[in-house]
């Protein structure tokens, strides 16, 4: 049985026929869910995010953003992947001195060809976040785009609701501190959302009423479509706008398309119960 | 600093198996692969090949296909190399590393 | 497999002078902006040590005295001027596809 779409798409891959069938299947990938090249994969109730780049074994060195050494730009990708988190090549070569590593082990190889990187304060971006050095202040940029993600409430781990997975990764990114997926559908009780400024820099909308009044004002300008357009949305509900001609189809969590008719493999389904993520 | 180090010496008699360890320190242990490398007694460097420390994929030279495994206990930073059914050929100090850092070595010495 | 020879086997040169190691390949280990042939130092009982990586980068730490140059097939270890504790056995080695090293030139200060 595939863990991955990509094994459907290799030749000696894995018979997917029936991957379609899964209705029911609750996924936990989107295209967001794991940035910096790593396969995300859905196993029980775990989220992994795949970081096996292969990396090959010349020795060509190059010092990462974060102060350590990698045997070659393979390697740096790779470890970006793990963390979820940027490591831009500073240098070629070894760094002078590495801020070592994770596991509090001391310094790396130097090279005698670079300088020591100086200490940023642009290294207090986490999350995602990308730094923004000419900003007066140190501003963490959140690069995150979910306009494409599909609505699918969330309970996130800071008691909010949200839309989708995205916008938890960009709550998360904005705040800077660890956001996570706890339960399907929205939170019982919750006031907080968080929204992106124009110039991409993160700021804080604390809303009067909560998200799932807003939700409901907003259903208000839709009605159920007449009878007639019964069968209109294939996996969703069909919705009629007084501002619209054409109704139109709320899709359900996994589907896309005019009439909810494509099975969308970006979207992010929520295991219900807590949701661990992981990398490997 | 970046510290490899091997187990100690060991002494075998044709047919058993040794298992060498090298732990290393001072780095993140996947951000490089873990070479081994073969040095008979007065004789040049061999290399036998090498581990990826992220994957656990091993690669081995042509002359080390068969009796001879790589393998990793990526928590404890510790790569081994076992050699099984040992010979009088694989007599010979044993390093691991790569590139800038290398272990102190070990001596296998196989003998009746 | 990308054999390496290394010549000579083993030179003599006095305290000051220019002592001069070649590499060949059997194939082009130059690729992608790229030359993958490394230098490297062994003294008696201890492993091997990086003097030059990528053909002509040096290691840190490593005297400038040592100096590295060539691409796709053949290669040049210098060190200039030689000093007493230079003397050692030098192999070449190789980082594309299967690694190899070459096998080694000894070097002895007259």
């Known amino acids: 049985f595939p863990t991955s779409l990509s094994d459907c798409q290799t030749p000696t891959g894995w018979n997917c026929s029936g991957y379609d069938d899964r209705e029911n299947d609750l996924f936990l990938c989107d295209t967001n869910t794991c940035k910096f090249d790593g396969e995300c994969l859905r196993i029980g109730d775990t989220v992994t995010c795949v970081c096996q780049f292969k990396c090959n074994n010349d020795y060509v060195p190059v010092c990462g953003s974060n102060g350590e050494s990698y045997q070659n730009e393979c390697y740096l990708r790779q470890a970006a992947c793990k963390q979820q988190s940027e490591i831009l090549v500073v240098s070629e070569g070894s760094c002078a001195t590495d801020a070592g590593s994770g596991s509090g082990d001391g310094v790396h190889e130097g090279s005698g060809e670079t300088s020591q990187k100086e200490t940023s304060t642009c290294d207090i971006c986490q999350f995602g976040a990308e730094c923004d050095e000419d900003a007066e202040d140190v501003w963490c940029v959140c690069n995150i785009d979910c306009s494409q993600t599909n609505f699918n409430p969330l309970c996130a781990s800071d008691g909010k609701s949200y839309d989708n997975a995205c916008q938890i990764k960009e709550a998360s990114c904005q705040k800077q501190e660890k956001i996570e997926v706890m339960s399907l559908g929205r939170c019982q009780d919750n006031t907080t959302t968080t929204t992106k400024s124009e110039d991409g820099h993160y700021a804080r909308t604390d809303y009067a009423e909560n998200a799932n009044k807003l939700e409901e004002s907003a259903r208000e300008h839709h009605i159920p479509c007449p009878e007639h357009y019964n069968g209109f949305c294939m996996h969703g509900k069909c919705e009629h706008s007084i501002n619209m001609q054409e109704p139109s189809c709320r899709c359900d969590a996994g589907y896309t398309g005019q009439h909810c008719e494509k099975k969308d493999y970006s979207v992010l389904y929520v295991v219900p119960g807590p949701v661990r993520f992981q990398y490997v | 600093q970046i510290q490899l180090v091997q187990s100690g010496p060991e002494l075998k008699k044709p047919g058993e198996t040794v298992k060498i360890s090298c732990k290393a320190s001072g780095y993140t242990f996947t951000n490089y692969g873990m070479s081994w490398v073969k040095q008979a007694p007065g004789k040049g460097l061999k290399w036998m090949g090498w581990?990826?420390?992220?994957?656990?994929?091993?690669t081995y030279a042509d002359d080390f296909k068969g009796r001879f495994a790589f393998s990793l206990e990526t928590s404890a930073s510790t790569a081994y190399l076992q050699i099984n059914n040992l010979k009088n050929e694989d007599t010979a100090t044993y390093f691991c590393g790569g590139d800038a850092y290398w272990g102190q070595g070990t001596l296998v010495t196989v003998s009746a | 497999d990308i054999v390496l020879t290394q010549s000579p086997a083993s030179l003599a040169v006095s305290l000051g002078q220019r002592a001069t190691i070649s590499c060949r390949a059997s194939k082009s280990v130059s690729t992608s902006g790229y030359s993958y042939m490394h230098w490297y130092q062994q003294k008696p009982g201890q492993p091997p040590k990086l003097l030059i990586y990528l053909a002509s980068n040096l290691e840190s730490g490593v005297p400038a005295r040592f100096s590295g140059s060539g691409s796709g097939t053949d290669f040049t270890l210098n060190i200039h001027p030689v000093e007493e504790e230079d003397a050692a056995t030098y192999y070449c080695?190789?980082?594309?596809?299967?690694?190899?090293f070459g096998g080694g030139t000894k070097l002895e200060i007259k």
């Open positions: 080695q190789h980082s594309r596809e299967l690694r190899t």
């Open positions: 581990i990826n420390t992220y994957t656990g994929e091993p």
